[in-house]
């Protein structure tokens, strides 16, 4: 017997469906209009079909008062070639509904995006996570995109972006997005940083993340972001092949003084990178290669140190008193 | 054993200028950097700077910031104290101490865990 | 600069009684004090170090206790052996560093 294409839990809070059949029975999905988080994984389909069976023009008001009754908070959709068309009338549609997160992976979009009708609402999204998203109009992509979500979005999550780098002049502003993360894009490298952040397209970032993103120096990455006018609260480098020294020829950087907190734990590091912030409340540099205790010039002042899982603090390395340079806490690095 | 060996004790007339050796033993001297402390007679400790073994970068405190001068000979596992232009002020102990790091659960710092047996300096015309 | 200062600057005392010396930082240090003993003609000994750590070796009649800006190091059984100057030291987790002006422990 073939396994039920959908789950919901024993809450009606988490409805999974895999629809991995050639011609799958998509009403199944109707089991999960009760659930809070859904997710639909279409088993690498082409949704070209779909088109013909939908009308995609259709006034989406007409489903208003269905889709505002439905519970769901958080959306996932993976594993399908989409048309773009079909993109925007599932968000016009969702735009009714009190949809706060969406995430999409391992998605192909087809076609062009269509613009936003004078009379169409944008879909008010507080998260959105993109992952593995191909899209037939290259970099402007994201801009394509915006149009269709209301300025509200707060955390933008774009991995394995086959275009990480966006065509700036059309993406408009995102007032109220306070997390970034281009994690999972090894080739972004620094100078795909500076063309990703958009300068003054991001006034309100606090977090950004760029584990496994190519970065190359610590340096590097605070001239991208002085560059591009951002000024994180919150930085995350790990992840990365980090060089420790900075090339004398390259100009020094001054750190943004909002920055207070530093992760570069697992970047292969084996001193404590030069130019860094001259005071951070927390500053992680666990499952680094760094051999030797720092001196005091080469740590800046920090409220809160992560060295766990260094060779220089590995048990059994002869200690001068107990307690000495081992915080006891080996992680698995 | 760790060692700091400190060179013996001089007597200088003021202008003149002196040099004092530290060197040390028992452990990875450019592993731990070094410092510097002032003690006059009947008086307390007095902080005066250190040099980072890796770079040879000193750091002074702001009363030894003009006359005094750290250096290394990494190769003979040695710090050096120069003091130039000599005044009756300065005669005092001077002792070389090594700055152990210590880090357990996100706290930090660093100690003096090993001392020389110092270096009196006298300074009379 | 952050200035120590140490107080009383002696104490007269006898074998046997608990004997409390106080450093008073003249800014939050947080826990960044260490306390040394210095005997006549030697140099000075780690005792504790981040105010309550006793370093090896050292008896546990030996306890360090505060943070922020007050911190308190105390015998609590003195021997003769502990006759010494003990000094404070403020060990920010970035130098400068400084010194208070330290406590003589005298026989009664």
């Known amino acids: 017997t073939t396994p039920e294409p959908c789950e919901l839990d024993d809450e009606d809070f988490r409805c999974v469906c895999n629809f991995s059949e050639p011609q799958p029975d998509w009403s199944e999905a109707f089991q999960c209009v009760s659930a809070v988080e859904v997710e639909i994984h279409a088993g690498g389909l082409n949704l070209e079909p779909f088109l013909k069976r939908v009308d995609a023009d259709a006034d989406p008001r007409q489903y208003a008062d269905t889709v505002k009754a439905l519970r769901v908070r958080r959306l996932t959709v993976g594993a399908a070639q989409v048309p773009a068309q079909l993109l925007v009338g599932a968000l016009r549609v969702l735009a009714y509904s009190r949809l706060k997160e969406l995430t999409l992976e391992d998605l192909k979009i087809t076609g062009t995006m269509p613009p936003l009708p004078l009379e169409a609402t944008g879909l008010a999204l507080s998260s959105l996570r993109l992952r593995n998203v191909s899209w037939a109009t290259g970099r402007s992509w994201l801009a394509e995109l915006q149009q269709w979500l209301k300025p509200g979005l707060k955390v933008l999550s774009i991995a394995q972006a086959h275009s990480p780098a966006f065509s700036c002049e059309q993406v408009r502003a995102f007032p109220a997005l306070t997390s970034l993360d281009l994690s999972d894009n090894p080739g972004l490298g620094e100078r795909g940083l500076m063309a990703a952040l958009c300068p003054h397209k991001f006034p309100a970032i606090q977090n950004l993340a760029l584990r496994n993103t190519g970065m190359e120096t610590p340096t590097g990455v605070c001239a991208a972001l002085a560059a591009a006018g951002v000024q994180p609260h919150s930085l995350d480098l790990s992840h990365n092949s980090l060089r420790a020294t900075v090339n004398p020829s390259a100009p020094r950087c001054m750190w943004s003084s909002a920055l207070n907190s530093l992760n570069l734990s697992f970047a292969g590091l084996e001193q404590v990178p030069k130019g860094l912030p001259a005071k951070l409340r927390v500053l992680d540099l666990s499952c680094n290669r760094l051999n030797r205790a720092p001196q005091p010039d080469e740590l800046p002042e920090v409220d809160n140190l992560t060295l766990d899982g260094n060779p220089f603090l590995v048990p059994g390395t002869a200690l001068p008193h107990e307690g000495s340079m081992n915080s006891g806490v080996v992680p698995a690095c | 054993q760790i060692q700091l060996v400190q060179s013996g004790p001089e007597l200088k007339k003021p202008g003149e200028s002196v040099k004092i050796s530290c060197k040390a033993s028992g452990y990875t001297f450019t592993d731990y950097a070094m410092n510097w402390v002032k003690q006059a007679p009947g008086n307390g400790l007095k902080w005066m700077g250190w040099i980072n073994t890796q770079t040879g970068k000193p750091t002074y405190a702001d009363d030894f910031k003009q006359r005094f001068v750290f250096s290394l000979e990494t190769s003979a596992s040695t710090a050096y104290l120069q003091i130039n232009n000599l005044n009756i002020e300065d005669t005092a102990t001077y002792f070389c101490?090594?700055?152990?790091?210590?880090?357990?659960?996100?706290?930090?710092?660093?100690?003096?865990?090993?001392w020389g047996p110092g270096t009196m300096v006298t300074v009379s015309s | 600069d952050i200035v120590m200062t140490q107080s009383p600057t002696s104490i007269s005392i006898s074998v046997g009684e608990r004997v409390t010396m106080n450093c008073k930082a003249s800014q939050n240090v947080g826990s960044n004090v260490d306390w040394y003993q210095q005997k006549t003609g030697q140099s000075p000994k780690l005792l504790i170090y981040?105010?309550?750590n006793r370093y090896t070796g050292v008896p546990d009649r030996f306890t360090g206790s505060g943070s922020g800006t007050d911190f308190t190091f105390t015998i609590s059984n003195m021997q003769a052996v502990d006759l010494a100057v003990y000094y404070c030291m403020q060990s920010n987790t970035n130098p400068p560093w400084t010194f208070g002006g330290g406590t003589k422990l005298e026989l009664k």
């Open positions: 101490t090594r700055s152990t790091f210590y880090y357990s659960s996100y706290i930090y710092g660093w100690y003096f865990d090993f």
């Open positions: 981040k105010a309550s």
